[in-house]
Interface confidence: low
């Protein structure tokens, strides 16, 4: 007869490992007992369990509650056992020794491989600001056995670099994603993807990018200068910009205080019925935590009774 087993048994951490050992004997041969032991190189054999044809299963104290026979029906020639809830420390070489009658003893070895699924963690890099050079956006670390694969899934253009640290029974892989920040990246997802043979599906952790910026400021409302005449109602100037974080707006008049009756409502400056007193240079100041911008305009209120039109100057400054 001969023993049938596997060279390698692979299980995911926490699963039950079936250690196969089947005696394929001639007619009339019987199995008296099957002894299972762990036989890692450099260490003495450590008994797991003894399956006796008459007395049944005896589990050694070190494996109490963790070694069982497979559920019935059982073949009397089958010496396979279940190792419950495999942990990383179970990884190694195992041997089954089968005592048969009348053929004698046989032995076979197998290797148990315990896959340790990774626990990924994503750490964002420093605050991203438009105008920076190549900057760390995020790093992703995953440790497992064998070493996991760490990649990135994103529409954002960037570069990646990886490094790994070996442990006695596992390996940690860290991947960094670097990019040159631009405002178009705002709100874009950056996803760390961890692959591992112990995972049913890839693990994904998503980080949403935030890039600080402030766009140039401009003022709307003076496109048709002929509308800015004495007595006109509802005249207004609107300051245009955008930024992250969202900017705040402030209106001032360069050549004096804001005239009475002029209303400031965030990015909008509202005028009462126009008079010549409303002529002047108005400045919109836009700012956020990242930067500030100014845009100034010259308002000339026209007297309809005068023939000559007046020019409007638009100036933008940072």
């Amino acid at each position: 007869g001969e023993l049938e087993t596997s060279d390698v048994v692979t299980v995911v951490l926490g699963q039950d490992a079936k250690l196969p050992c089947f005696y394929r004997g001639d007619s009339g041969e019987q199995v008296g007992q099957v002894a299972w032991a762990r036989v890692d190189a450099g260490e003495g054999a450590q008994e797991l369990a003894l399956l006796h044809s008459k007395y049944g299963l005896h589990v050694s104290p070190a494996y109490e509650g963790r070694v069982e026979q497979p559920p019935p029906p059982r073949n009397p020639l089958d010496g396979s056992v279940l190792l419950r809830n495999a942990v990383q420390a179970d990884e190694g070489e195992y041997e089954c020794r089968v005592s048969t009658f009348p053929a004698g003893s046989f032995q076979a070895r197998l290797r148990l491989r315990v896959l340790v699924p990774p626990l990924p963690s994503l750490n964002p890099g420093p605050a991203l600001e438009e105008g920076q050079g190549l900057t760390l956006a995020a790093s992703c670390t995953a440790e497992g056995s064998p070493a996991p694969s760490v990649t990135w899934d994103t529409e954002v253009k960037g570069t990646t670099s990886s490094r790994s640290f070996k442990h006695s029974r596992s390996a940690a892989v860290t991947s960094e994603f670097h990019l040159v920040p631009s405002r178009s990246m705002n709100g874009q997802p950056l996803t760390c993807v961890v692959s591992h043979p112990g995972l049913l599906q890839d693990q994904r952790i998503t980080h949403i990018l935030h890039v600080s910026f402030l766009a140039e400021a401009s003022v709307r409302g003076l496109e048709d200068q002929n509308l800015w005449h004495i007595g006109r109602e509802g005249a207004m100037l609107k300051c245009l910009s955008e930024g992250q974080p969202p900017p705040s707006y402030n209106w001032t008049r360069l050549d004096g205080p804001l005239p009475s009756g002029v209303r400031v409502d965030g990015d909008t400056l509202g005028f009462p019925p126009l008079t010549t007193e409303h002529s002047g240079i108005y400045v919109c100041h836009v700012s956020n935590e990242f930067s500030s911008r100014d845009s100034q305009v010259t308002v000339d209120v026209l007297d309809p009774q005068e023939d000559s039109g007046k020019q409007v100057d638009l100036v933008s400054a940072s």
């Epitope: 809830n85 942990v87 990383q88 626990l119 990924p120 750490n123 440790e143 640290f165 029974r169 940690a172």
Partner: antibody, heavy 122, light 107 residues
């Protein structure tokens, strides 16, 4: 015998800072990831932060991110938690705990210190 | 974050009773689950790891079962020293999260 002894707790005003220490003995400190877990009076357990063996990689609960910093000094077998900008809701007993030595796949915690009380009040 | 929901939040039992506490995860966590026991004024103590493995030194009357989202801690015959609060904890993803606890009181 594995021992974890926390210190550094006490009464602090909102906005103040504290530094907790956890002295470890009886095991190979460098081989273990370590965590801080807290428990507000009469409440359940809340994980705060973890530092791994690998390059000191750390993770934080959202509630403390940006205010707390975990670190370790392997030469002194000591774990630290620097707590800044403290709030009333940070009031709790803070435990340091060891990640199980032979099960690096996860973060179950097999040894805990006795805890140190942090009270944030004006 | 993964939410862990324990039930019941408290129970009254007598010495010798069989006690069962359940824990449900808001998403699958394989067997990445631990059970802890905490007595008043003391630190938590690890009872069960990997959902069903008994931590060294813990009495065999404690057992754990389950995988995926539903888990159970069973005390086969409640002893006087078992009156305490029990917590489940997942560590499948960061942050690890605990159940709200189950207080086992004397009837």
């Amino acid at each position: 015998e594995v021992q974890l002894v926390e210190s550094g707790g006490g009464l602090v005003q909102p906005g103040g800072s504290l530094r907790l220490s956890c002295a470890a003995s009886g095991f190979s400190f460098t081989n273990n990831a370590m965590s801080w877990v807290r428990q507000a009076p009469g409440k359940g357990l809340e994980w705060v932060s973890r530092i791994d063996t690998i390059g000191g990689t750390s993770s934080y609960a959202d509630s403390v991110k940006g205010r707390f910093t975990i670190s370790r000094d392997n030469s002194k077998n000591t774990l630290y938690l620097q707590m800044n900008s403290l709030r009333a809701e940070d009031t709790a007993v803070y435990y340091c705990a060891r990640q199980t030595e032979d099960r690096s796949y996860g973060y179950d915690l097999d040894y805990w210190g006795q805890g140190t009380l942090v009270t944030v009040s004006s | 974050d993964i939410q862990m929901t324990q039930s019941p939040s408290s129970l009254s039992a007598s010495v010798g009773d069989r006690v069962t506490i359940t824990c449900r995860a808001s998403q699958g966590i394989s067997s990445y689950l631990a059970w802890y026991q905490q007595k008043p004024g003391k630190a938590p103590k690890l009872l069960i790891y990997a959902a069903s493995s008994l931590q060294s030194g813990v009495p065999s009357r404690f057992s754990g079962s389950g995988s995926g989202t539903d888990f159970t801690l069973t005390i086969s015959s409640l002893q006087p020293e078992d009156f305490a609060t029990y917590y489940c904890q997942q560590h499948y993803t960061t942050p690890p999260t605990f159940g709200q606890g189950t207080k086992v009181e004397i009837k």
